[in-house]
Interface confidence: low
């Protein structure tokens, strides 16, 4: 099973060697967006319906305080990066903590300058990894030298960072409406004419959780080969659930031979191609 994870993504910007005020931030819980930072209001806010419903006001107060502190840290760090030329530059920090099935934990943070990774840190061992490129080496040296000057950046500080992250993760996983619920997909099948005699049939699954799903076209009950089907990515839809699609091209008039097969969390179903109109089939909800 995938570990439970909490991930924060922060970014600060500089324009012509001047670090801009404020920062950008978002948070993901178990891969789902749950937090965004509102730069205008200078507040952390829920992202997605489930985060709004589940996590109380205190969450956003705490997150606002923590993100503000992290954002200030990141801005200070950007001012110490020496190779800044004119133009727009970005410094990004991605911080992750995980709880695995065996109760073991992991924690790391990764720094990117102008989108390029230059430093990774293990928050539990405090070990750093720097990519081979000379630019990454220079950036990492600048940053770590600055941190050494900063009395706050002790080993205790990194351990506390990891402990805070894990504490939040555990709290969020226990907050009321469970995130790891099962929500069956809504499936709809649509047809569109491509060329004379051929149509493309698309099977869309939406609003499902967890992420794992099987969606495939069948002809006379037999799955079509991979190379005759086109799949979309399984993407978050912003509501704590996912969406995806699969499409294939078939001969007009043969629609009744084709079905879309869906399997999700032990439930499965087949959905026929509509005759002349869009067909929407909604599975029974569990929540």
């Amino acid at each position: 099973a995938e570990p439970h994870s909490l991930r924060y993504n922060l970014m600060v910007l500089s324009q012509d060697e001047s670090v801009q005020s404020g920062f950008l931030a978002e948070g993901h819980l178990d891969g789902q967006p749950f937090l965004r930072y509102d730069r205008q209001k200078r507040r952390a806010k829920p992202q997605g319906q489930w985060a709004e419903d589940v996590l109380g006001a205190k969450t956003w107060d705490t997150e606002t305080e923590d993100l503000t502190e992290n954002g200030q840290d990141l801005r200070r760090t950007l001012t110490h990066i020496k190779d800044q030329k004119g133009g727009l530059h970005s410094l990004q920090e991605i911080r992750v903590c995980e709880i695995h099935e065996d109760s073991s934990t992991r924690g790391s943070r990764h720094f990117y300058y102008d989108g390029e990774l230059f430093l990774s840190q293990n928050l539990e061992t405090q070990e750093s990894t720097v990519p081979q490129s000379s630019r990454a080496q220079t950036l990492a040296m600048n940053v770590t030298n600055f941190w050494k000057e900063d009395a706050m950046k002790t080993k205790t500080h990194y351990r506390a960072m990891q402990a805070d992250c894990l504490q939040k993760l555990q709290r969020y996983l226990k907050s009321g409406v469970a995130i790891r619920r099962t929500v069956p997909p809504m499936v709809n099948v649509t047809c569109s004419e491509v060329s004379e005699g051929n149509i493309t049939v698309t099977c869309r699954a939406s609003s499902f959780y967890p992420r794992n799903i099987t969606l495939t076209w069948r002809q006379d009950g037999v799955s079509l080969s991979h190379n005759t089907q086109q799949w979309g990515d399984v993407l978050p839809d912003g509501n704590g659930t996912y969406q995806t699609w699969v499409a294939t091209r078939i001969r007009q008039g043969e629609e009744q031979r084709f079905t879309c097969y869906m399997e999700h969390s032990g439930n499965h179903g087949t959905h026929p191609v509509p005759s002349g109109k869009v067909l929407v089939l909604q599975s029974q909800r569990t929540d």
Partner: antibody, heavy 117, light 107 residues
């Protein structure tokens, strides 16, 4: 001290309306989701509705959906339950309750609603 | 909606007894379960949250366990003030639901 105080309970005829209030004190009301829970005479507890701390989201039990409306006024530290189309089976003591997301550790003393012709 | 079934519905016990009440959920609810005590004419009181965490001020003779679908409330040594009705409640998904209650009486 932390307190929730309900009011507005009364004897009403079936089909009529009633509005309950719940006044909060001793804690930051605007930080908490608040719920209504009811208990019919001699029966168990039944959750009725919840409103999010800022009033944006509301959920209802199936038994009251479409008839009851939960609302709050954070400036007045007050929660409301507007009960329309009342039925005999709505007869109960109505409690407002709150606390952390995973338990109700603040309860009001309850207000009695009797629906009878 | 998730159904919670408590057993037994009522039970008689003596002071000093160890008592166990169970609560079964119709589907998995992780550890999103609370236990309450209610005495006649009184307001419910929170005992346990998150299936096993003791609410502050609650005596340590009360304990909760379980996760998923099966949960237990245990009173290690019954005291006279423990005779009451006990309810479990799930917070895993809306609508929030309560068990039907377990009435604990003096034998």
């Amino acid at each position: 001290q932390v307190q929730l105080v309900e009011s507005g309970g009364d004897v009403v005829q079936p089909g009529r309306s009633l509005r309950l209030s719940c006044a909060a004190s001793g804690f930051t009301f605007s930080n908490y989701n608040i719920h209504w829970v009811r208990q019919a005479p001699g029966k168990g507890l039944e959750w009725v509705a919840v409103i999010r701390y800022d009033g944006i989201n509301k959920y209802y039990a199936d038994s009251v959906k479409g008839r009851f409306i939960i609302s709050r006024d954070n400036s007045k530290n007050t929660l409301y339950l507007q009960m329309n189309s009342l039925r005999a089976e709505d007869t109960a003591v109505y409690y407002c309750a709150s606390g952390p997301p995973d338990a109700f550790n603040i309860w009001g003393q309850g207000t009695m609603v009797t629906v009878s012709s | 909606a998730i159904q919670l079934t408590q057993s037994p519905s009522s039970l008689s016990a003596s002071v000093g007894d160890r008592v166990t009440i169970t609560c079964r959920a119709s589907q998995g609810i992780s550890s999103a379960l609370a236990w309450y005590q209610q005495k006649p004419g009184k307001v419910p009181k929170s005992l346990i949250y998150d299936a096993s965490s003791l609410e502050s001020g609650v005596p340590s003779r009360f304990s909760g366990s379980g996760s998923g679908t099966d949960f237990t409330l245990t009173i290690s040594s019954l005291q006279p003030e423990d005779f009451a009705t006990y309810y479990c409640q799930q917070f895993n998904s809306y609508p929030i639901t309560f068990g039907q209650g377990t009435r604990l009486e003096i034998k």
